[in-house]
Interface confidence: low
């Protein structure tokens, strides 16, 4: 009986990368392409559809176009190989490759789709008030994450994190969290990024700077003070200058009416 | 060895519902379709619809309108349910494995005879 | 839904001949040059059994006499030699079009 067979039934790859998954078929002498039908699918969705020695591109999934292919090349070897590019996460699933020669068989192989939280994005600012540190962690990855917060000396200690949908694909897991701390200069923090599964770990090293800019949220706030800061000085300016001109009781009463009216009325009352 | 085997009752009372369990061993749900199809003496065979081995279910438009078909992976399990039964749903109904791409019914189930009556 | 008509509904056949069952589709059940027609067998109280799929390709193993041919919408299930095991309902099945569909049946006997 006509039988096809497969090294690997299942393949493991990360998103963006390559694969090439193979499935074997008896040929004696030399292949005779126009008897030979080869169907690569994954549920509902054609990939490779090669008959009487062409692929039919018209037939393929447009989720697939121009990332999978059939290794022309290996079919002389037996070997019905497709490849895929760039591998996304919806590639996830089970294919099946159809192999008709003469017999006719299939086999089906598993497809797994992971992309580990590598590259990590960290941040450090500095509360100007409270004088504590915000560290924060971001990336990108699938499955879903927790972060897991540590210092130097091993103590865990508790961020807060956010999960949202990426921006580049549906399916990729945006995940944010952050660390309010008091720290000191030159202190280590770790942020970890666990998914389940051996080591599914990705951390980044966090060191607590000298010196700390002032944050982008600060420089505004300084911004909109500014020009209200500015205004007060000059009023403050002419009401020194009033004083000195011996007509200060009137603005003063103005003034003092003015600036307590909202809080302390019987004050008001009491000095007109 | 790859085997379907079915339960569920013979008899239904008309405009009540059908349910099958379809039990399977010696391959995955998660890596085959499972099909129904019924076979009467006045319709012949007929395909009801599929669920993929990703979840997603494709029904017979005929009948989605009173068709559900769940699974549970774990306990390989496959479950048909119609509503609405009428005495011409009367039939053999049947599960089958989705072979090569899923063109065809590469192994059947046992086969659940179901009788609509009063 | 595309339409399977089988003919002849009964055939009758000598052990060691040919038998020759034929299927046509209402419409094409080619799938992009694929012609997308199973052939099954079904004997009394059992399930059907998938013989041949994609119109000429034998299902691993089934017997080398039992064979496909056809495109479009015009097939053909032939049998050779006919043998005494082979004494059964025969349909055949389109996947060309959702939903799949499958003829009435021919029942082969012996003569």
């Known amino acids: 009986a006509f039988t096809i067979t497969v090294s690997k039934d299942l393949y493991v790859v990360e998103y963006g990368g390559n694969v090439t998954m193979e499935c074997k078929f008896p040929v004696e002498k030399q292949l005779n392409l126009f008897a030979l039908i080869v169907y690569w699918e994954m549920e509902d969705k054609k990939i490779i559809q090669f008959v009487n020695g062409k692929e039919d591109l018209k037939v393929q999934h447009s989720s697939y176009s121009q990332r999978a292919q059939l290794l022309k090349d290996q079919l002389f070897l037996g070997k019905a190989a497709l490849q895929i590019t760039d591998v996304r996460l919806q590639d996830a699933g089970v294919y099946c490759c159809l192999i008709g020669y003469g017999g006719a068989d299939y086999k089906r192989i598993t497809l797994k789709v992971h992309a580990p939280y590598r590259n990590i994005s960290q941040r450090i600012s500095v509360d100007p008030v409270t004088s504590e540190h915000e560290l924060m962690c971001q990336a990108e990855g699938y499955p879903e994450a927790e972060v897991i917060w540590t210092s130097s000396d091993h103590r865990v200690l508790s961020g807060k994190t956010t999960i949202t949908n990426s921006n580049r694909e549906e399916k990729l897991f945006n995940v944010t969290s952050t660390l309010n701390i008091n720290a000191t200069a030159n202190e280590i923090f770790y942020c970890t990024f666990q998914r389940s599964g051996p080591e599914e770990n990705n951390t980044a090293e966090l060191v607590i700077p000298e010196r700390l800019p002032v944050p982008a949220s600060e420089r505004t706030h300084f911004m909109i003070l500014g020009p209200f800061l500015l205004l007060l000085g000059v009023v403050l300016a002419v009401t020194f200058c009033l004083k000195k001109h011996g007509r200060m009781m009137d603005v003063e009463k103005c003034c003092t009416r003015d600036r307590n009216s909202k809080k302390r009325n019987d004050i008001q009352f009491e000095e007109t | 060895q790859v085997q379907l085997k079915q339960s569920g009752p013979g008899l239904v009372q008309p405009s009540q519902s059908l349910s099958i369990t379809c039990t399977i061993s010696?391959?995955?749900?998660?890596?085959?379709?499972v099909h129904w199809v019924r076979q009467s003496p006045g319709k012949g065979l007929e395909w009801l619809g599929v669920?993929?081995?990703?979840?997603?279910?494709d029904y017979n438009a005929a009948f989605t309108s009173r068709l559900s078909i769940n699974k549970d992976n774990s306990k390989s399990q496959v479950f048909f349910k119609m509503n609405s039964l009428q005495a011409d749903d009367t039939a053999i109904y049947y599960c089958?494995?989705?072979?090569?791409?899923?063109?065809?019914?590469?192994?059947w189930g046992t086969g659940t005879t179901v009788t609509v009556s009063s | 839904d595309i339409v399977l008509t089988q003919s002849p509904a009964s055939l009758a056949v000598s052990l060691g001949q040919r038998a020759t069952i034929s299927c046509r589709a209402s419409?094409?059940?080619?799938?992009?040059?694929?012609?997308?027609m199973q052939w099954y067998q079904q004997k009394p109280g059992q399930p059907p059994k998938l013989l041949i799929f994609?119109?000429?390709n034998v299902k691993s193993g089934v017997p080398a006499r039992f064979s496909g041919s056809g495109s479009g919408t015009d097939f053909s299930l032939n049998i050779h030699p006919v043998e005494e095991d082979d004494i059964a309902m025969y349909f055949c099945?389109?996947?060309?079009?959702?939903?799949?569909?499958f003829g009435g049946g021919t029942k082969l006997e012996i003569k």
């Open positions: 089958a494995r989705g072979g090569g791409p899923d063109w065809y019914f590469d192994v």
């Open positions: 419409e094409s059940v080619e799938y992009y040059g694929t012609s997308l």
């Open positions: 099945q389109q996947s060309g079009k959702v939903p799949h569909t």
């Open positions: 010696g391959f995955s749900l998660t890596s085959f379709g």
């Open positions: 994609a119109a000429s």
């Open positions: 669920i993929w081995s990703g979840g997603s279910t």
